[in-house]
Interface confidence: low
Amino acid sequence: WQVRCPPTWGQVQPRDVPRSWGHGSSLALEPLEAEVRKQRDSCQLVLVESIPQDLPFAAGSLSAQPLGQAWLQLLDTAQESVHVASYYWSLTGPDIGVNDSSSQLGEALLQKLQQLLGRNISLAVATSSPTLARKSTDLQVLAARGAQVRRVPMGRLTRGVLHSKFWVVDGRHIYMGSANMDWRSLTQVKELGAVIYNCSHLAQDLEKTFQTYWVLGVPKAVLPKTWPQNFSSHINRFQPFQGLFDGVPTTAYFSASPPALCPQGRTPDLEALLAVMGSAQEFIYASVMEYFPTTRFSHPRRYWPVLDNALRAAAFSKGVRVRLLVSCGLNTDPTMFPYLRSLQALSNPAANVSVDVKVFIVPVGNHSNIPFSRVNHSKFMVTEKAAYIGTSNWSEDYFSSTTGVGLVVTQSPGAQPAGATVQEQLRQLFERDWSSRYAVGLDGQAPGQDCVWQG
């Protein structure tokens, strides 16, 4: 459960817009704030992950709830509405010309979404234009059953993409994390996210970010110079949401990128990341798919050392132990390695400067028929004080022109059994990955070498 938070979420559109949506640019939100406050929330946060098939960890290793299970469970709870923001959709094998039994979980998810529409539960989808999965028919199938779909032209608006990945269910439950609506995210790609149950105040705050996409998905939409007041957030890094998650005193807030899609009161994603890094006293452990202290997609490429500097400063000035786990797969850009080596070169144990970088290689095994898979797609960071779960890779474009969201959670230790805080759970997941045989030091990684599991 939590403390009541500012209830402006209910003002995104006039009160008389029906739940089944009007034809305007906003979705109706239910339940209304007065009803929400009638009964207490009982917030619960569950870390969720996908472990690719045939990626065994050591016996007894801990794990989070499987993502596919969590998604199906979340849809089972839906009674009124499901709002999904996702870069692209590809829930069926044929979308990418693959016939593989591991796509069945994605197909079950698509089936579940169709059933929801049949039960008069409304589904609203904000997706990216441009998008990756051009052949996917998922959204046509769902639109034919009444789903509302908006393709948000981020390419035109900010020269980026809609890269966010989150759900808001019934204005009460949330999924957010690294996974797109892709069957590979459930069985072939390593992902990490969080599901938050029974947390209307946080859900309705994240809904405001969904609404920013929704209004930009109408024809000829333009970015507002100033977002209207009803998009503003009262939950941010200066005033995080405070409450109890399973009885544990918790603060939490959502950040967003790019800044152009941060209405008043919304903490920009980059600022959230820097704040979490800046508050660390003991350690910063980060697991990201890509790490480039540059731009990635704009030309000419620019140097962008913001996150790199923050990690270096934490290690050098405060003696914070920095560990960076970066993904390494068949599609990894080898130009990343000099930056990783440069960061690690700062390490100097004699001067109490500790910076370690490893790459995480998911063995391809007999799954080579599946493109853009067998990779660690997670984007999270944990310190002794906070957990950060994001949707963005670490290079400039993700924070300046592409949409993303972050979740920053801090739980008070001591009020619950050891190991129960979110940051402690996330630390344990990171350390499981870091100490596994799939995490390889940079010494063993020649520049430009393919990220192929040497087993």
């Epitope: 500012p6 209830p7 003002q11 009638k38 009262h234 109890l244």
Partner: antibody, heavy 118, light 107 residues
């Protein structure tokens, strides 16, 4: 430190209205709910309603819906409660209180004593 | 509305005593129970929120416990300044409601 300042007393005639104030200081006014509570002489406490200054959202106890109107002036960090069609039943002390962690009313004003008398 | 009942309307105790004041809700309020102290001059202070959490600045001789529908406030070592009326309040379901109060007096 958090302070809620209320005028000490109001003497009003039956059938009229009264608007009492509660000036907040020592915290961000727009970030906390403000509650109003009634206490009749020698009696217990009754919750009237609350208002969120950041959005003017209000909640009322059904019993006071047609009696009380809650408003705020964020520029002066002041919350107001107007009571209408006053009768002797409305003679009471009225407190404002800040809604804090887990909705507990963590700081209270000194109360305004309203006497309805002709 | 949820009814809050403080069965003891007044209580006499000696300085140094351990005093317990009880409060019952008409339905389960999931620990959303707060305790307030009202001094004879009308000043009201929050003592305990969420059943057992001490508000800042409140002496540690005050403690709270309970669950479901039954809750209590305990003063472990009664002092002169504790002479007041104590109210419980549920914060589980709107409208918030208070108990009738327990007046604590010195024997």
């Amino acid at each position: 430190q958090v302070q809620l300042q209320q005028p000490g007393a109001e003497l009003v005639k039956p059938g009229t209205s009264v608007k009492m104030s509660c000036k907040a200081s020592g915290y961000t006014f727009t970030s906390y709910w403000m509650h109003w509570v009634k206490q009749r002489p020698g009696q217990g406490l009754e919750w009237i309603g609350d208002i969120y200054p950041g959005s003017d959202s209000t909640n009322y106890n059904e019993k006071f819906k047609s009696k009380a109107t809650l408003t705020v002036d964020t520029s002066s960090s002041t919350a107001y409660m107007q009571l209408s069609s006053l009768t002797s039943e409305d003679s009471a002390v009225y407190y404002c209180a800040r809604g804090g962690w887990l909705d507990a009313m963590d700081y209270w004003g000194q109360g305004t004593s309203v006497t309805v008398s002709s | 509305d949820i009814q809050m009942t403080q069965t003891t309307s007044s209580l006499s105790a000696s300085l140094g005593d351990r005093v317990t004041i009880s409060c019952r809700a008409s339905q389960d309020i999931s620990n959303y129970l707060n305790w307030y102290q009202q001094k004879p001059d009308g000043t009201v202070k929050l003592l305990i929120y969420y059943t057992s959490r001490l508000h800042s600045g409140v002496p540690s001789r005050f403690s709270g416990s309970g669950s479901g529908t039954d809750y209590s406030l305990t003063i472990s070592n009664l002092e002169q300044e504790d002479i007041a009326t104590y109210f419980c309040q549920q914060g589980n379901t709107l409208p918030w409601t208070f108990g009738g109060g327990t007046k604590l007096e010195i024997k």
